[in-house]
Interface confidence: medium
């Protein structure tokens, strides 16, 4: 059977296919898809290999009417380089000499200056020229070749391999040589394919089940790196959550060189975007980045600089990070227009269960615009899909010179954009060069502007028009899910229930409030529970949340408020130091890290208690 890279070379005029009878005889025969001798494949941008012999089509010289035969593949040889010319001509590179059927006297395929029907070739069974099934470089992982591409065919222990192999290995890992002669050069890498054990090339975040692959030893351009990820059904890394950045900072902390991520501004008319189409809502630029120099359109994560991001020229050669698995985005279903009967008040326009209204004439600063929308029963608009954006542009009477407030902002947590209506950020469409968020230009709010209605961050104090959005009247009541084993309003994780205490309280007051709830200020047993709590409180606007840890009882010895051993810590830098006090978790960029505060400071808090009753699904019967 043909694999997708293989093809038969077919001449329509003769209705016959090229047949490699032997290395010195390349002729034609009646087409037979099962014949190994008729199968060919591209093994580089310009070389065609016979699958049967693992040798490449070539000529002895670039002259008219010489026989085309098979040679040991040599990527440097000018006599093995082929290119598709107009229509279905295949020619030797750089010359007007073509792959030709031969004639009655000459059974071999020949190199010939004529470009008639006998020099025209298609992939058998299609109308396509031979280049339509062109070569796709396979970028290696690990190994010792800096992520170079597989060189097919390659020689290992005097045998030629045209595919990845586990030969010479007891673990079954698939590998390839990255030069034609592995025996001499000893350069290799593992193939970006699925094989027994290939999962260990990935690190899985236990909180989100997203997997990451750090290719720090590779040296690829941004586009090559992206291709390598895609070959593994993955994409270059996107980071949309503070938790994700924290996890990757930890994962890359022992490295020093930059690693490509998916952030880029390669689209001509729009701004910064993730290659996997995740929303660009979290910013973690290195000071001074992104620099506006032309050509610096791709972004690297800098492990040596606290994993911050820097824009570089895409042709630089760096390591890279791939990401696969569940997206880190919250699952958020946007109803389609037909799903929802939408009834709107006068002057509001309906779309997919919501009503929209542009306020163009009464210009307001963002805060006042938000207040007005909320008084009208809505909020500044959130936008969750390209279709919703298109509706606003095309149906609402949006004009090309408009500059209108939408609900996106990073007022609560700097460099982390959120919708003011609390819906998750699932989509962004920034203008070219945006968001241009610079610390010295406090641009915490977002506008739609220009003919396409793309977005830019803007100082919140500008008086502008704005767009309001509200739920249409026909939508049913919201359902608050009660998690099994936990009371309403509590969140379950493993054996425990957790609740955020919303009253600003001293440590003692917080402890008392938890006790009144038959609970206690949270303990943190390990990094998994810490990761859960980071995701639980890390993105909230308040700066601190009390935990149950303090050294009130014995100065210098930190203990939980309940009889629980301290087996794990997650101190912020310079903590705990020598000052006595009570421990609170930070939010924002330092999300989850522990600081020692004065116990009479006021903060919110997290209560915890054992979940009730059966906490696991029934034991499977064997």
């Amino acid at each position: 059977l043909l694999d997708t890279r293989q093809f038969l070379i077919y001449n329509e005029d003769h209705k016959r296919c090229v047949d490699a009878v032997s290395p010195s005889a390349v002729q034609t025969a009646a087409c037979n898809q099962d014949a190994e001798s008729q199968k060919f494949r591209w093994v580089s941008e310009s070389q065609i290999m016979s699958v049967a012999f693992k040798l490449c089509l070539g000529v002895p010289s670039k002259t008219d009417w010489v026989a085309i035969t098979l040679y040991a593949c040599d990527s440097k040889s000018e006599f093995q380089k082929w290119e598709c010319k107009n229509d279905t001509l295949l020619g030797i590179k750089g010359e007007d000499l073509f792959f030709n059927y031969g004639n009655r006297q000459e059974k071999n395929i020949m190199l010939y200056k004529g470009s008639g029907l006998w020099s025209r070739w298609k992939i058998y069974g299609t109308t396509d020229n031979l280049c339509s099934r062109g070569y796709e470089a396979m970028y290696t992982l690990l190994g010792n070749a800096n992520g170079a591409t597989c060189a097919f065919p390659f020689k290992f222990e005097n045998k030629w391999y045209a595919d990845c192999t586990s030969a010479g290995r007891s673990d079954g890992w698939l590998w390839c040589g990255t030069t034609t002669d592995y025996d001499t050069d000893k350069l290799f890498g593992y193939c970006p394919l699925k094989f027994e054990g290939s999962e260990s090339l990935w690190n899985k975040d236990p909180l989100t089940s997203v997997s990451y692959q750090i290719n720090s030893k590779s040296a690829l351009t941004w586009h090559q790196a992206r291709k390598s990820c895609q070959q593994q059904n993955a994409e270059l890394l996107s980071i949309t959550e503070i938790h994700e950045q924290t996890y990757l900072t930890g994962l890359t902390s022992s490295l020093t060189s930059g690693l490509w991520i998916g952030l880029n501004s390669l689209s001509f008319n729009s701004g910064w975007q993730w290659s996997d189409r995740s929303p660009f809502r979290y910013l973690n630029w290195l000071p001074g980045s992104p620099s506006a120099e032309p050509g610096k359109s791709c972004v690297s994560l800098n492990p040596g600089k606290n994993a911050k991001w820097e824009n570089l020229e895409c042709v630089q050669k760096l390591g890279y990070i791939c990401k696969k698995g569940n997206t880190t985005l919250n699952s958020f279903v946007i109803p389609s227009e037909s799903d929802v009967p939408t009834h709107c008040p006068s002057q509001w326009w309906p779309y997919a269960g919501h009503c929209y209204k542009i306020h163009r004439d009464e210009k307001k600063i963002q805060r006042d615009a938000l207040t007005t929308c909320r008084k009208e029963g809505g909020d500044l608009t959130s936008i969750h899909t390209i279709e919703e954006l298109d509706f606003i542009i095309s149906q609402l009477g949006y004009e090309p010179n408009d500059e209108l407030w939408i609900g996106l902002n990073d007022i609560k947590i700097q460099m982390y954009f959120e919708w003011s209506d609390g819906t998750p950020v699932t989509f962004t469409k920034w203008l070219r060069g945006e968001p241009s968020h610079e610390n010295n230009r406090q641009e915490d709010c977002v506008v739609m502007k220009g003919k396409d209605g793309y977005w830019a961050d803007r100082g919140c104090e500008w008086p502008l028009g704005y767009i309001c959005k509200m739920k249409s009247r026909s939508q049913g009541p919201e359902i608050v899910e009660v998690e099994k084993g936990c009371r309403k309003g509590w969140k379950k994780h493993h054996f425990y229930c957790y609740m955020i205490g919303h009253t600003l309280s001293t440590f003692a007051e917080a402890n008392q409030t938890c006790n009144n709830e038959n609970a206690y200020l949270t303990t943190i047993e390990d990094r998994y529970e810490q990761a859960f709590l980071t995701s639980f409180v890390g993105l909230r606007p308040e700066k601190y949340f009390w935990t149950g840890l303090s050294d009130i009882q014995t100065k210098g010895t930190f203990q939980w408020t309940i009889e629980e051993e301290v087996r794990f810590t997650h101190w912020n830098s310079d903590m705990p130091g020598r000052k006595p006090g009570c421990v609170a978790m930070r939010t924002g960029i330092a999300g989850g890290l522990w600081d020692v505060l004065k116990c009479d400071e006021k903060a919110k808090f997290v209560c915890k208690h054992w979940a009730e009753g059966v906490t696991h699904p029934p034991k499977p019967t064997t």
Epitope: N203, K204, D205, P206, L207, S209, H494, F495, T523, E525, D526, Y528, E529, W560, I562, E563, E564, E565, V566, R567, H616
Partner: nanobody, 121 residues
Framework: QVQLQESGGGLVQPGGSLKLSCAAS????????MGWYRQAPGKQRELVAA???????NYADSVKGRFTISRDNAKNAVYLQMNSLKPEDTAVYYC???????????????WGQGTQVTVSS
Amino acid sequence: QVQLQESGGGLVQPGGSLKLSCAASGSIFSIKTMGWYRQAPGKQRELVAAVSSGGSTNYADSVKGRFTISRDNAKNAVYLQMNSLKPEDTAVYYCNADGVVAWDQPYDNYWGQGTQVTVSS
């Protein structure tokens, strides 16, 4: 993979005592909470007691004051000391653990095969 092996079950008279033991073996990186569940014939399985890696404990109301759960983190073992046993304590007792086999894996829930406890005169 993590295996849990229970021992110590048996037949005991009302008012008597038994001590159940459970040891985890296999490829263990870390064990968080360990606990005991029980299932009487025709009834739903219920939590008896659980203990966190730091030593905090949780008991079903029906066993409070009679049963004591303890744990040896070094041995990845959990114990259930059952005193003042009653006929209604008769059930298959299952050991349970939230364990993780590698640093980059999420927690999995593991179960023992169960040990029979019968309280009867």
